[in-house]
């Protein structure tokens, strides 16, 4: 399908790898049914300004991830950040661009928060 990048592998990381019985890091091949889409994801925490990756890997078919070429978290200050995307290794880099809520305009311009990159 034109304009759709298939995900065949994702960067894999698991901070809790021992308990979860997985590898700690690597590349994860994303297999699946022909009618199902596969995505890459990243989850991380912001501990006092320091980025701590929790998990990265393949993500099951999820409409919220469709046609996203970049891995971007848009929620404002979540406890656990999450992003998903489509395309090989698209979760190698991830960023945070919170969507500003549409409110009454103020006299002071709002500066968007800076993104975080891996």
């Amino acid at each position: 399908i034109l304009g759709r990048s298939e995900t065949q592998e994702c960067l894999f990381f698991n901070a809790n790898w021992e308990k979860d019985r997985t590898n700690q890091t690597g590349v994860e091949p994303c297999y699946g049914d022909k009618d199902k889409r596969r995505h890459c994801f990243a989850t991380w925490k912001n501990i006092s300004g320091s980025i701590e990756i929790v998990k990265q890997g393949c993500w099951l078919d999820d409409i919220n991830c469709y046609d996203r070429t970049d891995c971007v978290e848009k929620k404002d200050s979540p406890e656990v950040y999450f992003c998903c995307c489509e395309g090989n290794m698209c979760n190698e880099k991830f960023s945070y661009f919170p969507e500003m809520e549409v409110t009454q305009p103020t006299s002071n311009p709002v500066t968007p928060k800076p993104p975080y990159y891996n």
């Epitope: 308990k19 994303c30 699946g32 890997g57 393949c58 993500w59 099951l60 656990v80 999450f82």
Partner: antibody, heavy 120, light 107 residues
Framework: QVQLVQSGAEVKKPGASVKVSCKAS????????MHWVRQAPGQGLEWMGF????????SYAQKFQGRVTMTRDTSTSTVYMELSSLRSEDTAVYYC?????????????WGQGTTVTVSS | DIQMTQSPSSVSASVGDRVTITCRAS??????LAWYQQKPGKAPKLLIY???SLQSGVPSRFSGSGSGTDFTLTISSLQPEDFATYYC?????????FGGGTKVEIK
């Protein structure tokens, strides 16, 4: 079709052990983890742990550590859950459930359940 | 361990009603949340995974929303076969934990 078939009901005495089997069919056995969940009469669901069929590694809930053993036989696509030192509180329905290796790891196929009754 | 708190514990509703069940995690679990339906004497059945993704074969009247700590399962128009107990479950960190369940009963 994808199916998990569990062994039949068991009645055990306190202090004994029980071994429940779960035979998988209709999919590649080693491509999915197998988790075990139990449900006491009239109660909710309680996660017990899982086994990775490809390598046999396991992870158990702390509550069952030392009493539960999960094994697998790849030649028959069967996983086993053995619970020892049984007590009356272990009376429950025990379920196996298939879980994708991929996040967010839902339990998408369940066995029919095995009733284990612990009574003196 | 992450605690999952479901509310209400039971709800009485009629066919055609809109039913909403909530689930709260004691700490952030991002979108690592699934919803299951269980009927008496039967195994649980997966309805929703990744907080909002509908499992194959599940009717579209079921929907899930939320992320972080607060999640919702909605049945838009209750059908006779929907009277059952519903459980939320987190898979973000071990041990995996379930909510206490919500029984949907006939009014």
């Amino acid at each position: 079709q994808v199916q998990l078939v569990q062994s039949g009901a068991e009645v055990k005495k306190p202090g004994a052990s029980v071994k429940v089997s779960c035979k998988a069919s209709g999919y590649t056995f080693t491509s999915y983890r197998m988790h075990w969940v139990r449900q006491a009469p009239g109660q909710g669901l309680e996660w017990m742990g899982f086994i990775v069929p490809s390598g046999g590694s396991t992870s158990y809930a702390q509550k069952f550590q030392g009493r539960v053993t999960m094994t697998r036989d790849t030649s028959t696509s069967t996983v086993y859950m053995e619970l020892s030192s049984l007590r009356s509180e272990d009376t429950a329905v025990y379920y196996c459930a298939r879980v994708s290796m991929y996040a967010p790891e839902p339990m998408d196929v369940w066995g029919q359940g095995t009733t284990v009754t612990v009574s003196s | 361990d992450i605690q999952m708190t479901q509310s209400p514990s039971s709800v009485s509703a009629s066919v055609g009603d809109r039913v909403t069940i909530t689930c709260r995690a004691s700490q952030g679990i991002s979108r690592w949340l699934a919803w299951y339906q269980q009927k008496p004497g039967k195994a649980p059945k997966l309805l929703i995974y990744a907080a909002s993704s509908l499992q194959s074969g599940v009717p579209s009247r079921f929907s899930g929303s939320g992320s972080g700590t607060d999640f919702t399962l909605t049945i838009s128009s209750l059908q006779p076969e929907d009277f059952a107990t519903y459980y939320c479950q987190q898979a973000f960190s071990h041990p995996w934990t379930f909510g206490g369940g919500t029984k949907v009963e006939i009014k």
